[in-house]
């Protein structure tokens, strides 16, 4: 008789990342019989929802259902119908919604309520929509990259307790940059975490981890730009803002009402004699860098050492994976190679920012001008944040690895979030047998 392939015994999970600038849907897949193994869950689909982040729907909540339709329908196609009802769906909203909640808890709740009602209409097992904390965002990003890198697997041969990976089990730190916040998470070396708010204790696969994490709200790349503009316009002599963070020849109009719409610019708010101002790019990396540094208050630190704004930061330790916008921006700038020194990155940023806007538009004809215009700022901001904000040095720069995906799964908080909510990361090391390390593809 002919051998018939047995039906795949797999499970699926869906996580929606409702970020400040957009929403992405991720579909994960894993073999049902290996739920507690490390590294078996992998991403099979990413669907970027067309449009802005959900916080922008505050005045048009009735449009949220349509907004989510395409990607939810894509999930319907990718996941076999027989598994729809048992596939969990989670939506986590990040800093964009944290900011909206700061402005109005009622408006944030209304957006989430409509999101929940929309997602409940699908045949999946909807598990709720919530605003995750900055601490969770940092922690789940750290879990994701270390899970994908195999750092949690205490790989032991089934017949002995001698690990065959000896020098490779030190976890990676996680550096995440979004539009509205940025997270830094790592295991410090024998260092007391002086601030309890920044301390996390995990027991994963039989090992204890004391993890430092902090999320800097308003220090994502988009909100940092709004902050910088709000700070700089304070001292402008008229409605022309000559801005070193934009290419020479670049011009754009900014509404003052838009500038002060976000809670992130409140500290710079003042009455201006105009409703609109014009940015005129002058493309000077050094001046842009100096302007960005003014966003980091380093004059006050109640701990042995701080990042900025009085936030405790232990000495950096080990390798770091830098993902999300850290990766997208540096990839665009062709600066993701590990061997590109910090000095070379700075040199290349100087050259890039100094290029005339018309030249840039011609060189990158396929890129939307809105995004294209901000790479000089974003690249400079990344350098400033990593060097002056987090205290990386020219030497430790080579320990930063700009990562988009690992084993085909996006680096970011969503996988860690799902692993946690589906109880797929055991506290103790599962008992392994000779067969338990067969590989799933």
């Amino acid at each position: 008789t002919q051998n018939k392939a047995l039906p795949e015994n797999v499970k699926y999970g869906i996580v929606l990342d409702a970020g400040s600038s957009h929403t992405s849907l991720y579909i994960y897949k894993w073999p049902a019989e290996k739920e507690n193994d490390t590294g078996v869950v992998h991403q099979v689909e990413e669907c970027r929802v067309k449009g802005p982040g959900i916080s922008k729907f505050v005045q048009k909540v009735n449009e949220i259902g349509i907004y989510l339709t395409d990607c939810m329908e894509r999930a319907r196609e990718v996941i076999p119908r027989s598994q729809h009802q048992e596939t969990p769906v989670y939506l986590g909203a990040t800093a964009g919604m944290r900011l909206l909640r700061m402005e109005s808890e009622e408006l944030a709740d209304r957006v989430l309520d409509v999101v929940e009602r929309s997602l409940s209409n699908y045949p999946f097992d909807f598990q709720g929509a919530r605003i995750i904390t900055g601490q969770e965002e940092g922690a789940y990003g750290w879990i994701t990259i270390n899970y994908l890198l195999g750092k949690f697997s205490q790989k032991t041969r089934w017949f002995s307790i001698v690990p065959y990976e000896t020098n490779n089990q030190e976890t990676f730190g996680a550096l995440d940059l979004g539009g509205a916040s940025t997270q830094v998470t790592f295991v410090p070396q024998n260092q007391t975490i002086e601030s309890p708010d920044n301390a996390l204790q995990f027991r994963l696969y039989g090992k204890d981890y004391n993890v430092y994490t902090h999320s800097f709200l308003c220090y994502g790349k988009d909100q940092a730009l709004w902050q910088k503009l709000a700070k700089d316009i304070q001292v402008a002599s008229n409605e022309i803002l000559r801005d070193p963070c934009f290419h020479p020849g670049y011009e754009a109009a900014v509404n003052v009402s838009d500038l002060y719409k976000t809670p992130c610019t409140k500290r710079f708010e003042m009455t201006l004699p105009f409703q609109q101002f014009r940015i005129q790019g002058i493309g000077n990396y050094q001046q842009c860098h100096q302007s960005i540094l003014e966003l980091f208050n380093t004059s006050y630190c109640p701990y042995s050492q701080c990042a900025f704004n009085g936030i405790f930061l232990p000495p950096l330790q080990g390798d770091f994976g830098a993902f999300s916008a850290f990766y997208f921006v540096m990839k665009f700038l062709n600066l993701t190679s590990e061997k590109v020194s910090q000095e070379k990155v700075t040199e290349m940023m100087k050259k890039f920012c100094a290029q005339p806007w018309e030249e840039i538009k011609t060189s990158y004809a396929g890129v939307k001008e809105k995004y294209l215009s901000e790479y000089c700022f974003s690249g400079t901001y990344i350098l400033s944040l990593l060097l002056q904000g987090y205290h990386f040095t020219a030497d430790s720069w080579e320990h930063i690895h700009f990562i988009g995906k690992i084993q085909g799964s996006d680096a970011g908080w969503t996988l860690g979030y799902m692993l946690n909510l589906t109880n797929m990361i055991p506290a103790e090391q599962p008992l392994s047998t000779p067969l338990s390390h067969s590989t799933y593809v």
Epitope: Q43, V44, E45, E46, L149, E165, T166, N167, N168, D319, K331, S337, E338, K339, V340, E398, H399, H401, I403, G404, K405, I406, Q407, G408, S409, V441
Partner: antibody, heavy 118, light 108 residues
């Protein structure tokens, strides 16, 4: 299973061009970079370049600038490498390989043997 | 570019012996970017070890890797006849990605 399929052989005239294909299956094509390598008879491996199928972003070995052009067709999960102005020096086996973080190549194609001969 | 030098070029060994291949880099490499492959005549290369010491899927545990900086090694704990092949190290640390010249393992 994860597979990269390449045609077995191509015979081309000097000065001509050839477009090599590499069809991916068993994984999400846009989730991994695709790399191309050259191996001349009895020689070691040389890296030609890589392409990210999600956004067509490429990195190339300067040695192959003007010689190799990398493209992808997402709809058919196929990567291509066009080799131009071929000479006998280009006679080799060309492999495609999937790349992962750390830039290692975990899945390799079967290789296409290119012979440049008149 | 980073040049990887493998030594020796050819090695002859008997089944049951422990074998070590070395790979020396012209400049320091972070251990996350050094990998090893096995290639048998007429076949495609096969990933053996990735990120210095991680065993690739389906590779026997007699293979192991170690090293840091500019010096890396691949060890076969107990050689078997099927291990006859050429072994290459490769770096992904900088562009262009480069391979060592290979070490050919022959059986005595």
């Amino acid at each position: 299973p994860v597979q990269l399929q390449q045609p077995g052989a191509e015979v081309v005239m000097p000065g001509a061009s050839v477009k090599l294909s590499c069809k991916a299956s068993g994984y999400t094509f846009t989730s991994f970079w695709m790399n191309w390598m050259r191996q001349r008879p009895g020689q070691g491996l040389e890296w030609i370049g890589e392409i990210d199928p999600s956004d067509f972003y490429t990195n190339s070995n300067q040695r192959f600038k003007g010689k190799a052009t990398l493209t992808v067709d997402k709809s058919s999960s196929t990567a291509y490498m066009q080799l131009s102005s071929l000479t006998s020096e280009d006679s080799a086996v060309y492999f495609c390989a999937r790349g992962d973080f750390g830039w290692y190549f975990d899945v390799w194609g079967t290789g296409t043997s290119v012979t440049v001969s008149s | 570019e980073i040049v990887l030098t493998q030594s020796p070029t050819t090695m002859t060994s008997s089944p049951g012996e422990k074998i070590t291949f070395t790979c020396s880099a012209s400049s320091s490499i972070n251990s996350n970017y050094l990998h090893w492959y096995q290639q048998k005549p007429g076949f495609s290369p096969k990933l053996l070890i990735y990120r210095t010491s991680n065993l690739a899927s389906g590779v026997p545990t007699r293979f192991s890797g170690s090293g840091s900086g500019t010096s890396y090694s691949l060890t076969i704990g107990t050689m078997e006849a099927e291990d006859v092949a050429t072994y290459y190290c490769q770096q992904g640390s900088s562009l262009p990605r480069t391979f060592g010249g290979g070490t050919k393992l022959e059986i005595k």
